[in-house]
């Protein structure tokens, strides 16, 4: 009597998420009598897949018809495959008793789940930087099979190589996630820019998933300040103006200072943006210059983004007045801790 | 090349729990089943238990009242818990990887850590 | 539970001779599958056990071929064809039919 055989051909198949697997299993012989089980995995802990006498198995139908005389083939179909169906399955013959005893085992197909990667998401530093600062930036993306990924940053469309990336876990798996951080050194510049984290991946088809951060949400461009003397009027009041330039966000407190003392208060809001994204504000202070007796010192102090707060400062002659309509006199910075702790002195 | 590492608390006081830790590295979690085994100083060695990947776990009834364990494949990592120590728990304890393609049974332990060892004293 | 039993408890042997270990368990380990669930662990000293027969007659992987499994239902045999000097250690024999896996109580190889 020839020794019974159960055939599994494939030692491995394939099958995208969403998409039904069909693992073939054939016997040798017709007897001994008794069923066919399938089970994914083997040993005690091993799950029941389908059992053509007894059970309900809605994913799972058999390729031919079981109970037609002769029938040698015991394949079957699992409908909408997903990552957790991978694994290995066996398909195993039973000889007829109470209860059924396994005679013999199929050698197993791997099932491997073929899932796309979700859509990248990428996170930026929780606080803003300067320019020439490097600032990093993250990317994840998950649940794809198998574990073959390339992952790619761009900003503006130039490729960015000072990255690092991990794909976990490290052996096989169900599913896999990549997460890859990027380091970007940033320019005044950049307040329009963008970095793409592109991920491509065998389920793709070629057409890569990106995910987008704008640097904007990184990057802090401090002001230059510069303080000037618009021109003396007739009636003995100087306008002063404080030009606050090239800054982003927009989020300035502009504070202006008579002699040390605190004459008003303004918040930057509305403004037109700079083609660079920056932004540009002037305010003016009208010093009666007749009121006072001794020399004015104006100081415009601004405060960028919560940052500590810079000063410039302007000192109205009051001892000799020009009558003439006199042309613009720039300020000087006084004060050895007034200077635009930014480079931003205009 | 498939690497298991135990880590835990190496004295545990008595009616304590003892919590150990196995990082599988290498490999997958994935189609094996995962056990411990513990060796009493210059004793034999016991099986404790273990966890397939579909989280099905098999106790040894001896120790079934007060062992838990427990799988992260997430993190490649599975866990063992065993309430209300005693002396009698000293031991060096083993993780270990269990194969299993052939029908019922398993098919050998073929990878294990290289053992952690646990002191029950107060 | 199924009870297994080594024996001899210890085994003196020369190097280059030859050397055989005996296992038996409390019901037989040949399942209707035709296998034997029956193991063969070596734990050299201040080591973890390492596997090197399974499912009775199997050599696993990187074992020498001196080292051999014989054996079905309830006797099994453990053979060394040529002992060599890295071969001392306790040698276990294990059950993997049925939980609880159960190991014999062990057999210590030593040279005379």
């Known amino acids: 009597e020839e020794e019974l055989q159960v055939i599994q051909p494939e030692k491995s198949v394939s099958v995208a998420a969403g998409d039904s697997a069909t693992l073939n299993c054939t016997v040798s012989s017709l007897i001994p009598v008794g069923p066919i089980q399938w089970f994914r995995g083997a040993g005690p802990g091993r799950e029941l897949i389908y059992n053509l006498k007894e059970g309900h198995f809605p994913r799972v139908t058999p390729v031919s018809d079981p109970t037609k005389r002769n029938n040698m083939d015991f394949s079957i179909r699992i409908s909408n495959i997903t990552p957790a169906d991978a694994g290995t399955y066996y398909c195993v013959k039973f000889r007829k008793g109470s209860p059924d005893v396994e005679l013999k085992s199929g050698a197993g197909t791997e099932l491997s789940v073929r899932a796309k990667p979700s859509a990248p998401v990428v996170s930026g530093p929780a606080v803003r930087a300067t320019a020439e600062h490097t600032v990093s930036f993250t990317c994840e993306s998950h649940g794809f099979s198998p574990r073959d990924i390339t992952l790619k940053w761009f900003k503006n469309g130039n490729e960015l190589s000072d990255f690092q990336t991990n794909v976990d876990p490290a052996g096989k798996s169900v599913s896999y996630s990549i997460r890859s951080t990027a380091r970007v050194v940033l320019t005044r510049r950049d307040v329009h820019s963008q970095v793409i984290c592109e991920v491509a991946h065998v389920t793709l088809q070629g057409d890569p998933l990106r995910g987008t951060a704008n640097l904007s949400e990184a990057i802090r461009v401090p002001p230059f300040l510069e303080v000037t003397q618009q021109s003396m009027r007739a009636d003995n009041q100087v306008n002063v103006t404080c030009q606050v330039t090239k800054f982003y966000p927009q989020r300035l407190q502009l504070t202006w200072l008579e002699n040390g003392n605190v004459s008003r208060t303004e918040m930057a809001s509305a403004l037109p943006e700079n083609k660079d994204g920056t932004y540009n504000w002037t305010s003016w202070l009208l010093v009666n210059v007749s009121a006072h007796r001794d020399d004015v010192k104006l100081t415009c102090q601004v405060e960028h983004d919560g940052q500590p707060a810079v000063n410039k400062s302007f000192s109205v002659k009051v001892s000799a007045h020009p009558k003439e309509q006199g042309s613009n006199t720039a300020a000087e910075n006084t004060g050895t801790n007034e200077r635009n702790i930014y480079g931003g002195s205009g | 090349q498939v690497q298991l590492q135990e880590s835990g608390p190496g004295l545990v006081r008595p009616s304590e729990t003892l919590s150990l830790t196995c990082t599988v590295s290498?490999?997958?979690?994935?189609?094996?089943?995962w056990s411990w085994i513990r060796q009493p100083p210059g004793k034999g060695l016991e099986w404790m238990g273990f966890?397939?990947?579909?989280?099905?776990?098999f106790y040894n009834p001896s120790l079934k009242s007060r062992v838990t364990i427990s799988l992260d494949m997430s993190m490649n990592q599975f866990s063992l818990k065993m309430t209300s120590v005693t002396a009698a728990d000293t031991a060096v304890y083993y993780c270990?990887?269990?194969?299993?393609?052939?029908?019922?049974?398993?098919?050998?332990?073929?990878?294990w850590g290289q053992g952690t060892t646990v002191t029950v004293s107060s | 539970d199924i009870v297994m039993t080594q024996s001899p408890l210890s085994l003196p042997v020369t190097p280059g001779e030859p050397a055989s270990i005996s296992c038996k368990s409390s019901?037989?380990?040949?399942?209707?599958?035709?296998?034997?669930?029956l193991d063969w662990y070596l734990q050299r000293p201040g080591q973890s056990p390492q596997l090197l027969i399974y499912?009775?007659?199997n050599r696993a992987s990187g074992v020498p071929d001196r080292f051999s499994g014989s054996g079905s239902g309830t006797d099994f045999t453990l053979k060394i064809s040529r002992v060599e000097a890295e071969d001392v250690g306790v040698y276990y024999c294990m059950q993997a039919l049925q939980t609880p896996l159960t190991f014999g109580g062990g057999t210590k190889v030593e040279i005379k």
């Open positions: 290498g490999g997958s979690i994935r189609n094996y089943y």
């Open positions: 499912l009775g007659s």
């Open positions: 270990a990887r269990v194969r299993a393609y052939s029908g019922i049974g398993l098919d050998g332990t073929d990878v």
């Open positions: 019901q037989s380990l040949l399942y209707s599958n035709a296998y034997n669930y």
């Open positions: 966890i397939y990947d579909n989280g099905r776990t």
